[in-house]
């Protein structure tokens, strides 16, 4: 008698390794014997797929090689025109060993930055992944974290993070491990020990000691009066990291000496200054009973800053003013080449004024400094970021020279416009067109840990100033 | 000596408009900086404009931006706000104020000289 | 828009009394901070500029301090004809705001 068809066993979940072969059964009871179809996620697997082999008048289907795709529900359908279709289904789920899809590389890194090693990875169950620094398990902490996709997340890469790493992919089926990967860490650099100023007697021997440290070591090169140094000799050696240079000088003239660390990341360069003045004793003493005179402005640096045939006053404490003042704004102006476009025209303006005051001739020459007000704009607006380098640098005394208490002034110790309009001299060139004012360097709470200024930021100013107010 | 003087308020309807004047003297308008100051009957100071008329620069307060127009004249040592489609929140008494300096230090040196006010009543 | 947020908005006081009023700044500022005392039907006098700088003509028992993003104007012993309304303000380039205001009344 014709018999609907009844499936006597149900299609149950099958787990399958990849490259294994899985099977369902779809065992069928029917007269007339059944036709029986076969779907993945409904779609009609074809009887001609090479990748499947259908037995048993269609009861058995054979996935022949497991690939990671072939996860899904499979359902078998009997039908033999007798009653209706009956269908049974059940799922494969894929297994699958360990395997790092995306290992991690060799990287280097500047100290303080944030270091991101990849460890991407496949498998089922899904893999746990742990990191290995040298023969250790790397514990995570504060700093160090192992992210969802199981990359490796070092925040303020310190020197101790540099090593050998490798991630470690487990689950049930098995484990993979990377390939060893190296972290190194480079780091600015930075000088240790600044040479000292010295004044000394006319043919005396000096020796000047500057000692920096960075990854990779610096090297160190001396500068005199903002150029190399022509003569004297340098010694020069390096032990743990840390390069050790000493300048031996005959003094026969008074200087400006700048020892200048540098080293390389990638393509850039990093650097540290110290400077520090040598003096000749009898060269400093002052001439006659006042502190300078008036004389109109010949030098080159500060031509564009100063008004034309500006009257400043020349310190007669220097052996020669005119030579003297000139060079300390000239190592001084050379300084502000790393500074931001914003800061640039105005700290050179608040230099030149503030080493070249302008002068009130009279029976007592006397120096006009900069107003109070004016130093606070080229301070807190201009060259907020700036100034705090240069004050952190000036405290921890890597500022040693007279160039640099000549060229920060204090601005709380100058004279306020309110007090006298005479008393004080307002500062030129404090204005900059619509396109160079976008915004202004935020003003920082905390001084930066990096002792190089930053560019004026691109996001809107925690200074108050905005980036919407209108110039017309 | 230092001293401002502004003039120009009066009654106007919403919607309307009013120029007020302020006539420095004791300095030089192109050397410092100008403001404009008004207080609502009862309230706080509010700022409205600034210029610096050495840069030419101004700037409003988002309130009146687009209304309002600051501008000096140096030949006269005056400067000006002109106040267009008027509304009854800019009734107040407007002040005209100078601090030394462009644009950047003027903060720093302060509003050191004050006009007596003018009243502006906007009502229908 | 940077708020500065004025307090007390009054206070009452006797003469020689300390008397202190507080500026806190929304966000980062510079120290282009005045301090300005209004009489009614009157218009304000400047007393501290630049935070901490007192005005020409002022008397010594004023005096403003910063700590931050605080401002703080101090009269250190209140005279009958202090009592008035004092406003702080803040200066950007330009972006110029001022305090709610404190009243200083007689207790």
């Known amino acids: 008698l014709p018999k609907a068809p009844v499936i006597t066993t149900p299609l149950e979940t099958v787990d399958a390794l990849v490259e294994e072969v899985a099977t369902f059964m779809c065992a069928v009871e029917s007269y007339p014997q059944p036709e029986i179809s076969w779907t993945r996620n409904k779609i009609l697997i074809k009887l001609f797929d090479t990748r499947y082999s259908i037995r048993e008048n269609g009861q058995l289907l054979t996935i022949l090689s497991v690939e990671d795709s072939d996860d899904g529900i499979y359902c078998c359908t009997a039908n033999n025109g007798v009653g209706g279709a009956v269908e049974s289904c059940g799922a494969l789920q894929v297994k699958m060993k360990p395997k790092i899809t995306r290992p991690p590389i060799n990287v280097k890194i500047i100290e303080g930055l944030k270091a991101v090693l990849p460890c991407t990875t496949m498998g089922n169950p899904k893999p746990s992944v742990s990191w290995i620094k040298g023969d250790s398990p790397l514990r995570e902490n504060s700093r160090i974290a192992v992210l969802e996709s199981g990359s490796l997340r070092i925040h303020n890469v310190q020197k101790e993070d540099a090593g050998q790493y490798r991630c470690v992919a487990k689950n049930s089926l098995g484990t993979a491990y990377s390939k060893v990967v190296k972290l190194e860490v480079e780091v600015f650099a930075r000088i240790l020990r600044a040479p000292e100023s010295h004044n000394v007697t006319f043919g005396s021997f000096v020796t000047l000691h500057c000692t920096a440290t960075g990854i990779p070591v610096p090297t160190i090169t001396w500068i005199e009066n903002g150029n190399a140094v022509s003569s004297g000799s340098i010694q020069e050696s390096v032990k743990d990291r840390v390069i050790d240079s000493r300048l031996q000088l005959f003094i026969t003239k008074p200087g400006l000496y700048t020892c200048i660390a540098t080293n390389k990341h990638g393509e850039k360069f990093s650097t540290a200054k110290a400077a520090a003045t040598i003096s000749i004793a009898e060269w400093s003493k002052p001439q006659k009973d006042n502190k300078g005179y008036c004389a109109q402005y010949r030098g080159e640096v500060c031509n564009a800053v100063l008004a034309k045939d500006a009257l400043v006053f020349l310190n007669t404490s220097y052996a020669d003013p005119e030579e003297a003042q000139e060079l300390l704004v000239h190592t001084a102006w050379n300084e502000l080449k790393v500074v931001s476009p914003v800061c640039r025209p105005a700290a050179e303006a608040l230099l030149c004024n503030h080493i070249f005051q302008e002068c009130s001739p009279g029976v007592v020459p006397t120096p006009i400094p900069i107003c109070r007000e004016y130093c606070l704009a080229v301070k807190e607006l201009f060259c907020a970021k700036e100034w705090l380098v240069m004050e952190e640098k000036t405290h921890r005394g890597l500022y040693r020279s007279e160039m640099h208490l000549l060229s920060v002034p204090e601005c709380s110790k100058l004279p306020s416009m309110h007090w006298d309009p005479t008393a004080c001299a307002r500062l030129p060139h404090l204005d900059y067109n619509k396109e160079n004012l976008k915004t202004f360097p935020p003003m920082t709470s905390s001084k930066p840990s990096v002792d190089i200024p930053n560019l004026p930021s691109s996001s809107s100013s925690s200074f108050s100033v905005s980036p919407t107010y209108s110039m017309t | 000596e230092v001293q401002l003087v502004e003039s120009g308020g009066g009654l106007v309807q919403p919607g309307g408009s009013l120029r007020l004047s302020c006539a420095a003297s004791?300095?030089?308008?192109?050397?410092?900086?100008i403001h404009w100051v008004r207080q609502a009957p009862g309230k706080g100071l509010e700022w409205v404009a600034s210029?610096?008329?050495?840069?030419?620069?101004?700037s409003y307060a988002d309130s009146v931006k687009g209304r309002f127009t600051i501008s000096a004249d140096t030949s006269k040592n005056t400067a000006y706000l002109q106040m267009n489609s008027l509304r009854a929140e800019d009734t107040a008494v407007y002040y005209c104020?100078?601090?030394?300096?462009?644009?950047?230090?003027?903060?720093?040196?302060?509003?050191?000289?004050w006009g007596q006010g003018t009243l502006v009543t906007v009502s229908s | 828009d940077i708020q500065m947020t004025q307090s007390p908005s009054s206070l009452s006081a006797s003469v020689g009394d300390r008397v202190t009023i507080t500026c806190r700044a929304s966000?980062?500022?510079?120290?282009?901070v005045a301090w300005y005392q209004q009489k009614p039907g009157k218009a304000p006098k400047l007393l501290i500029y630049?935070?901490?700088s007192l005005y020409s003509g002022v008397p010594s028992r004023f005096s403003g301090s910063r700590s931050g993003t605080d401002f703080t104007l101090t009269i250190s012993s209140l005279q009958p004809e202090d009592f008035a309304t004092y406003y702080c303000q803040q200066s950007g380039v330009w972006l110029i705001t001022f305090g709610q205001g404190t009243k200083v009344e007689i207790k």
């Open positions: 004791g300095f030089t308008v192109s050397s410092s900086s």
């Open positions: 104020a100078r601090s030394e300096g462009d644009r950047y230090v003027s903060g720093y040196s302060g509003m050191d000289y």
């Open positions: 966000q980062s500022v510079s120290s282009a």
């Open positions: 210029i610096s008329s050495s840069y030419g620069s101004t």
């Open positions: 630049s935070a901490s």
